[in-house]
């Protein structure tokens, strides 16, 4: 008789990333008997919820259920029915909800409450919805990329070819850019982490890691743009804002009430003699870069070294994986190649921002105008943040790897979050090698 493979003994987990601009659902899968091995968990599905981030439903919380339905249905379809009841579901909300909580704890709680009730309706093992801290977001992103790169493993990796191969076990730093916050996380070289708030200690697979992390709230790409507009409109002589971060010929009317809706613009708020103003793009990279730099306060630093706004940052060390919006924006601009120098990136950005809006619209007809209009700002912001904010140089630029996926799994905090909550990263190295899951009878 022919040998038959035994039914796969696998487990699944679901994590929803409730970001400021959208929500994504990730489904992970791993062999049950290799739970404590490094590198065995992989992503089998990503579903982007069709719509904005959950914080936008604050005035219509009754619609959160319908908003989440499609992706939860997809999870029900992808995961075998026999596994539904033992599949954990976690929802982590990030900076969009942190900002809502700053405005009103009651409103943030109401949104999360409806989210929890909606997710409890599905046949999975719902484990709760919460707003994760910026420190957690940075830490879990760092765990994710190093787990996927096999950096925690002392033995042969489960996959054959690892991108960004380095011959040592030195971990990668993690650079995460969202819509409302940005995180930087890495292991500094023999450096004391001078501010306790930025220090994390991990013991993973028998090794100790002293990790630096910081999350800059309001410095995600969307909130940074709101900050820049609020700053620049202060000095505008009338309701026309000639903006170097938008393409020549671009025009958009902005409501002042929308501008001041976010806590991120509070420091620039002033009484303006108009309710609306019009952005008129002039498309100048250098001027845009200069305007963005004004968002970073570098005049004050109570430590040996700072990033900006008085936040401690040790000297950069090793390679970095830049993911989420760092990757999406640079991918759109075709600037993710390892071979593209920082000088070349700057050159390309100068050309891109100077392109007339009508030309850009024709070249990228399939892209929503709201997104399309902001790539000049976003690309310039990424360069400003990495170079002036985090002190990367033309030389150290080559240590930044713009990463979308690693071995089919998205780079981001969700995998690290699930690994931690399901206790799948042991403090000590597992003693014995478990059986292979491709057992035949």
């Amino acid at each position: 008789t022919q040998n038959k493979a035994l039914p796969e003994n696998v487990k699944y987990g679901i994590v929803l990333d409730a970001g400021s601009s959208h929500t994504s659902l990730y489904i992970y899968k791993w062999p049950a008997e290799k739970e404590n091995d490094t590198g065995v968990v992989h992503q089998v599905e990503e579903c982007r919820v069709k719509g904005p981030g959950i914080s936008k439903f604050v005035q219509k919380v009754n619609e959160i259920g319908i908003y989440l339905t499609d992706c939860m249905e997809r999870a029900r379809e992808v995961i075998p029915r026999s596994q539904h009841q033992e599949t954990p579901v976690y929802l982590g909300a990030t900076a969009g909800m942190r900002l809502l909580r700053m405005e009103s704890e009651e409103l943030a709680d109401r949104v999360l409450d409806v989210v929890e009730r909606s997710l409890s309706n599905y046949p999975f093992d719902f484990q709760g919805a919460r707003i994760i801290t910026g420190q957690e977001e940075g830490a879990y992103g760092w765990i994710t990329i190093n787990y996927l790169l096999g950096k925690f493993s002392q033995k042969t990796r489960w996959f054959s070819i690892v991108p960004y191969e380095t011959n040592n076990q030195e971990t990668f730093g993690a650079l995460d850019l969202g819509g409302a916050s940005t995180q930087v996380t890495f292991v500094p070289q023999n450096q004391t982490i001078e501010s306790p708030d930025n220090a994390l200690q991990f013991r993973l697979y028998g090794k100790d890691y002293n990790v630096y992390t910081h999350s800059f709230l309001c410095y995600g790409k969307d909130q940074a743009l709101w900050q820049k507009l609020a700053k620049d409109i202060q000095v505008a002589s009338n309701e026309i804002l000639r903006d170097p971060c938008f393409h020549p010929g671009y025009k958009k009317v902005v409501n002042v009430s929308d501008l001041y809706k976010t806590p991120c613009t509070k420091r620039f708020e002033m009484t303006l003699p108009f309710q609306q103003f019009e952005i008129q793009g002039i498309g100048n990279y250098q001027q845009c870069h200069q305007s963005i730099l004004e968002l970073f306060n570098t005049s004050y630093c109570p430590y040996s070294q700072c990033a900006f706004n008085g936040i401690f940052l040790p000297p950069l060390q090793g390679d970095f994986g830049a993911f989420s919006a760092f990757y999406f924006v640079m991918k759109f601009l075709n600037l993710t190649s390892e071979k593209v120098s920082q000088e070349k990136v700057t050159e390309m950005m100068k050309k891109f921002c100077a392109q007339p809006w009508e030309e850009i619209k024709t070249s990228y007809a399939g892209v929503k105008e709201k997104y399309l209009s902001e790539y000049c700002f976003s690309g310039t912001y990424i360069l400003s943040l990495l170079l002036q904010g985090y002190h990367f140089t033309a030389d150290s630029w080559e240590h930044i790897h713009f990463i979308g996926k690693i071995q089919g799994s998205d780079a981001g905090w969700t995998l690290g979050y699930m690994l931690n909550l399901t206790n799948m990263i042991p403090a000590e190295q597992p003693l014995s090698t478990p059986l292979s899951h491709s057992t035949y009878v």
């Epitope: 599905e45 982007r48 904005p52 936008k56 009754n62 259920g65 249905e73 929503k368």
Partner: antibody, heavy 120, light 106 residues
Framework: EIQVQQSGPELVKPGASVKVSCKAS????????MYWVKQSHGKSLEWIGF????????SYNQKFKGKATLTIDKSSSTAFMHLNSLTSEDSAVYYC?????????????WGQGTTLTVSS | QIVLTQSPAIMSASPGEKVTITCSAT?????MHWFRQKPGTSPKLWIY???NLASGVPARFSGSGSGTSYSLTISRMAAEDAATYYC?????????FGSGTKLEIT
């Protein structure tokens, strides 16, 4: 302005196959699922399935598995439905549609419909 | 799959009259959508998430219900409301439509 434009009417012979197209504009094509619906003459609506242009994921109504195949071409922001082994039972109006949230506003846009006639 | 049964299948109403169309589901669903279709045109979203009116829908329309029983109500029938109305659930794959209610004006 969001628009969903379908290909014109089709008259095909039994046993043949047909490919109906649906061109979307006015939004980022990968932002919303494209779903397909069948309406036989004088009858109700039947959900065929959907495709997520973001990653190509498809889901079908069991009844249409093997009959309909959904694909996309991101470069032209177009979705396609291929129907095979056609019989008179497949004669109907086929609609493509998108729905979801734009900001926090719910919408649902349908194409104008493609009439398929299967006849010898 | 969830089967949706609408009643009545056909009905007539006079201008100004109150009209109620019901939709019954074989399993509990947490919300219902309603579509309106006029001859020779595509269906239009009319009410979403049980009770929210789609853009441009007159305020004389309302929706309600929960679990397995939902309804669409027109407080005062108008000539332009003559059409076929379909309920739809988008809770469980495959998404399903009701059998339709043809509303005529008398």
């Amino acid at each position: 302005e969001i628009q969903v434009q379908q290909s014109g009417p089709e008259l095909v012979k039994p046993g043949a196959s047909v490919k109906v197209s649906c061109k979307a504009s006015g939004y980022s094509f990968t932002d919303y699922n494209m779903y397909w619906v069948k309406q036989s003459h004088g009858k109700s609506l039947e959900w065929i399935g959907f495709i997520d242009p973001y990653n190509g994921y498809t889901s079908y109504n069991q009844k249409f598995k093997g009959k309909a195949t959904l694909t996309i071409d991101k470069s032209s922001s177009t979705a396609f439905m291929h129907l095979n082994s056609l019989t008179s039972e497949d004669s109907a109006v086929y609609y493509c549609a998108i729905y979801g949230y734009d900001d926090a506003y719910y919408f649902d846009y349908w194409g104008q419909g493609t009439t398929l006639t299967v006849s010898s | 799959q969830i089967v949706l049964t609408q009643s009545p299948a056909i009905m007539s109403a006079s201008p100004g009259e109150k009209v109620t169309i019901t939709c019954s589901a074989t399993s509990s669903v947490s919300y219902m959508h309603w579509f309106r279709q006029k001859p020779g045109t595509s269906p239009k979203l009319w009410i979403y998430s049980t009770s929210n009116l789609a853009s441009g829908v007159p305020a004389r329309f309302s929706g309600s219900g929960s679990g397995t029983s939902y309804s669409l109500t027109i407080s005062r029938m108008a000539a332009e409301d003559a059409a076929t109305y379909y309920c739809q659930q988008r809770i469980t794959y495959p998404f399903t439509f009701g059998s339709g209610t043809k509303l005529e004006i008398t």
